[in-house]
């Protein structure tokens, strides 16, 4: 079983309702909002987490230049439609019949339209650039120590296979983490880079999705790494389709 047996909780997702009603009295957990059963040994999909959040009561230069096709999540929170596997449906609509297409991390990648809008496939986000600014410290972090700690964080806390952390760049106070995962690279059971990035984003904001009231304890050689700003860029396998009107606005 995958939930903590003793008090029947979901270690990897606090936005669940758990009860010992699984096979053999085992602990089983369901996501708030959708009621879908979740695997508590791994991360819950971003789509189910967003749905749960909406149902909850109403929180030499080495730096990479994001591509012209990079998306930033400017639309904020919405109540998404998820498929039976917990992934985002390619087309999302609101209560007023305004629809748009999203990528695999749920970020809008087309202009908004009406119910006639077609989204033929869910386009995969294969490259995520996490851009952080850390709070002032006595000195710069050692780059190799920082690199090793962040890779370990993604491997141990977010269960992301090390091969998907493509690079860690550092120019004090800016840290950039590059995650890359093509459709062909992602095997069954692999954590999706979009889910790992979302858990990391919530951790950094002090809104941890893991069980308990506590938060992230991230240190490099004993020095706390505290982030004061985060920007996340998403690159899709197929470039987004926005009208020129939006691009010149």
């Amino acid at each position: 079983h995958t939930a903590a047996q003793d008090n029947c909780t979901c270690p990897t997702n606090k936005m669940t309702v758990c009860s010992p009603d699984g096979p053999g009295g085992r602990c089983q957990c369901r996501a708030l909002g959708s009621g879908m059963a979740v695997d508590c040994s791994t991360l819950t999909s971003k789509c189910l987490l967003l749905k749960a959040r909406m149902s909850a009561p109403k929180n030499a230069r080495t730096l990479v230049r994001p591509s012209e096709h990079a998306l930033v999540d400017n639309d904020g929170l919405y109540d998404p439609d998820c498929d039976p596997e917990g992934r985002f449906k390619a087309r999302q609509c609101n209560q007023t019949s305004v629809c748009w297409c999203v990528n695999s991390v749920g970020v809008r990648r087309t202009d908004k339209g009406d119910l006639s809008l077609r989204c033929d496939e869910l386009v995969r986000t294969h490259h995520i650039l996490i851009d952080l600014r850390h709070r002032p410290t006595a000195g710069a972090f050692n780059h190799s120590d920082l690199d090793a700690e962040l890779r370990r964080l993604f491997r141990e806390r977010y269960r992301l296979h090390p091969k998907f952390v493509a690079a860690v760049h550092y120019e004090q106070p800016t840290i950039q983490i590059e995650l890359r995962q093509n459709t062909s690279q992602k095997a069954a059971g692999d954590v999706d880079i979009g889910d790992a990035a979302y858990y990391f984003e919530r951790d950094i904001k002090g809104e941890s999705l893991f069980q308990g009231r506590g938060g992230l304890d991230l240190r490099v050689r004993g020095e706390p790494l505290q982030v004061e700003r985060t920007l996340i860029y998403y690159l899709d396998e197929i470039p987004p389709k926005f009208s020129m009107k939006r691009l010149t606005a």
Epitope: P11, Q211, G212, R213, G214, G215, L216, D217, R219, G222
Partner: nanobody, 123 residues
């Protein structure tokens, strides 16, 4: 799968000392906060002490302050509870617990549990 194995429990006289150990195996717990809880006979399980993964922060319940000390050895994936000045009311099953990696040492974040070791304080 996560496994936590406690040892060091036993019978001790009032005023005596014991040192409990808990070895973590399965997933790496060098970056997990760890803690000790206890369940006295016929009572609910209660928090005793926690320690951050770096060992730089500890947190104790009022009833153990000044008597119990939590520590850890990350090279051995082991956490300890040194218990001094033991009293009859310390009699309980003592459970080791661990958080998700990189979680802080808040007791509410402890999600993985050992099976417990019995400590009996009696003359």
């Amino acid at each position: 799968q996560v496994q936590l194995l406690e040892s060091g429990g036993g019978l001790v006289q009032p005023g005596g000392s014991l040192r409990l150990s808990c070895a973590a195996s399965g997933r790496t717990f060098g970056r997990a906060a760890m803690g000790w809880f206890r369940q006295p006979p016929g009572k609910e399980r209660e928090f005793a002490a926690t320690i951050s993964w770096s060992g730089s922060n500890t947190y104790y319940a009022d009833f153990v302050k000044g008597r119990f000390t939590i520590s850890r050895d990350n090279s051995k994936n082991t956490v300890y509870l040194q218990m001094n000045s033991l009293r009859a009311e310390d009699t309980a099953v003592y459970y080791c617990a661990a958080s998700e990696p990189y979680s802080d040492y808040d007791p509410s974040g402890m999600v993985y549990w050992g099976k417990g070791t019995l400590v009996t304080v009696s003359s």
